[in-house]
Interface confidence: low
């Protein structure tokens, strides 16, 4: 009788991850008598994946009753299949033996390439706000994906952006990789309703890419710009000063009043009104009794805004001058607007 | 597993430093900023300082500045936390928390815990 | 820097008892409010944070509530588990502060 071969007729078999691989064997004879194993690898480090004879494999099932004495087809399926089971498959026929059986012949071996999808994209920016014109990055990670070969894009609002790095890691051979990149995004007094999104495209997923966003709303600090005017009211000795803070997000906000550099109220923004580009806008006003004032009195609105320093606008109140003469007077001196940004 | 792993127990003399450090696993590093906070033998949580993890930007309390300094190595993804010219009433377990990844600052994740003593 | 007042500094109470904590800020600080439960000898764990939200995997008879300078922490049945002291921490601006922290002892 000829001597057995052993034949596996697939050099290569590509399975997604989580599917089942079909790993194909057959022996021309049934001389020697012995069992099949299954490999995975070669050489001393090989790993047994399955033992005709004995042993538990829980996730491997023979394609045809194994145990039947005329049985030659020793194929084998492996199912819920991962990266990690990537590789080149031997089946190897043992001939009996004593005490252990002794190999005798093995197959080619069959590559198998595991297609593992890349997990959802996640997106994350920056620890701390930053202000407009500040140059923040976000960086996007995706893992566990093979092949290698795969493609990253960013966008800001549905605009591709260019400024960005990414490295997929291992550089060498591997089960399966990663992939990491950083984008610079220059930020602008109008991102509070942006996004920003990073999409990858990898063969798995079939020309639909996965993609993971960040809003913009997490990294932007807008801060605030101040108004300070006077109206008179009906009262001839009062005087109502308004303190427009405008555009500024997020909402964290906190006005103090003073009276010649004594604080008279503090009050924390609650009722704002929010613009369309999504900042907030909101207004203080101070009643202010001029006959208990003998000099001219110097009204400041002094605003702490997302825990940044103080940013204050103040106004000279006129006592000598008459309530009513004074309605159009929305001079106001800037004491100093410190944008520093802590992180 | 998320987790801030901290250095072992000091003891040090006054007049010298120490420095702390709190390894992160499980998260990405560069994401959140990290804080300092002490707790002296019986005392309540007193605030050191904060640090970017991303960007190294450094928030000090006022009663430290001078003395201490904040670092992080994103290669190891560890924090570090320096205190010089060491006093007595330094003695306490010092702690890294990472905030919560908020707008604000809160602390999800803590370090067991460092002690420093200062003794002559 | 914004002062944070914990009250009472330490309560007795049986298991089963609601136990009321309350803390006060210098100045209005919104709802950036957290708290924390700390047993001797271990770190500090987030119960609540931006005032009233509970943290992942906190029971639920822990509730927060509270805005602007005045803010609550109750615990609605008290387990033997919750005998522990209890700080507040406003996030609303460096430097970030702590309350004073309030022992809840076994009456």
């Known amino acids: 009788e000829e001597e057995l071969q052993v034949i596996q007729p697939d050099k290569s078999v590509l399975v997604a991850a989580g599917e089942t691989a079909t790993l194909r064997c057959t022996a021309t004879s049934l001389i020697p008598v012995g069992p099949i194993q299954w490999f995975r690898g070669a050489g001393p480090g090989r790993e047994l994946i399955y033992n005709q004879k004995e042993g538990h494999f829980p996730r491997v099932t023979t394609v045809s009753e194994s145990t039947k004495r005329k049985n030659m087809d020793f194929s084998i399926r492996i199912g819920n299949i991962t990266p990690a089971d990537a590789g080149t498959y031997y089946c190897v026929k043992f001939r009996k033996g004593s005490p252990d059986d002794v190999e005798f012949k093995s197959g080619a071996g069959t590559e198998l390439s595991v297609r593992a999808k890349p997990s959802a994209p996640v997106v994350s920016g920056p620890a701390a706000r930053a202000t407009p014109q500040h140059t923040v990055s976000f960086t996007c990670e995706s893992h566990g994906f093979s092949p290698r070969d795969i493609t990253l894009k960013w966008f800001k609002n549905g605009n591709e952006l260019s400024d960005f790095q990414t490295n997929v890691d291992p550089v060498g051979e591997s089960v399966s990789y990663s992939i990491h990149s950083t984008a610079k995004v220059v930020l602008t007094r109008e991102d509070v309703h942006s996004q920003v999104i990073c999409e990858v495209a990898h063969v798995t997923l079939q020309g639909d890419p996965l993609r993971g966003t960040a809003n913009l709303s997490e990294t932007i600090r807008v801060p605030p710009t101040l108004e300070v005017t006077q109206q008179p009211v009906r009262a001839e000795n009062q005087v109502n000063v308004t303190c427009q803070v405008r555009k500024f997000y997020p909402q964290r906000l906190q006005l103090t009043w003073l009276e010649n550099g004594n604080v008279s109220r503090t009050e924390t923004a609650s009722t704002v009104t929010e613009n369309k580009d999504g900042t907030y806008n909101w207004m203080s006003w101070l009643l202010v009794n001029v006959s208990a004032h003998r000099d001219d009195v110097k009204l400041t609105c002094q605003v702490e805004h997302d825990g940044q320093p103080a940013v204050s606008k103040s106004h000279d109140l006129k006592v000598s001058a008459h309530p009513k003469e004074q309605g159009s007077n929305t001079a106001a001196e800037n004491t100093g607007s410190n944008e520093r940004n802590i992180y | 597993q998320v987790q801030l792993v901290q250095s072992g127990a000091e003891v040090k003399k006054p007049g010298a430093s120490v420095k702390v450090s709190c390894k992160a696993s499980?998260?990405?590093?560069?994401?959140?900023?990290i804080s300092w906070v002490r707790q002296a033998p019986g005392q309540g949580l007193e605030w050191m300082g904060w640090?970017?993890?991303?960007?190294?930007?450094?928030n000090y309390a006022q009663k430290l500045q001078g003395r201490v300094t904040m670092t992080t190595d994103t290669s190891t993804s560890t924090a570090y936390m320096e205190l010089r010219s060491l006093r007595s009433d330094d003695t306490a377990v010092y702690y890294c928390a990472r905030e919560a990844g908020s707008s604000w600052y809160d602390f999800d994740l803590w370090g067991r815990g460092t002690l420093v003593t200062v003794s002559s | 820097d914004i002062q944070m007042t914990q009250s009472p500094s330490s309560v007795s109470a049986s298991v089963g008892d609601r136990v009321t904590i309350t803390c006060r800020a210098s100045?209005?600080?919104?709802?950036?409010l957290a708290w924390y439960q700390q047993k001797p000898g271990k770190a500090p764990k987030l119960l609540i944070y931006a005032a009233s939200n509970l943290q992942s995997g906190v029971p639920s008879r822990f509730s927060g509530s509270g805005s602007g300078t005045d803010f609550t922490l109750t615990i609605s049945s008290l387990q033997p588990e919750d005998f522990a002291t209890y700080y507040c921490q406003q996030g609303a601006s460096f430097p970030i502060t702590f309350g004073g922290g309030t022992k809840v002892e076994i009456k």
């Open positions: 640090i970017s993890a991303y960007g190294g930007e450094t």
């Open positions: 100045q209005g600080i919104s709802s950036w």
């Open positions: 499980g998260y990405t590093f560069g994401g959140y900023g």
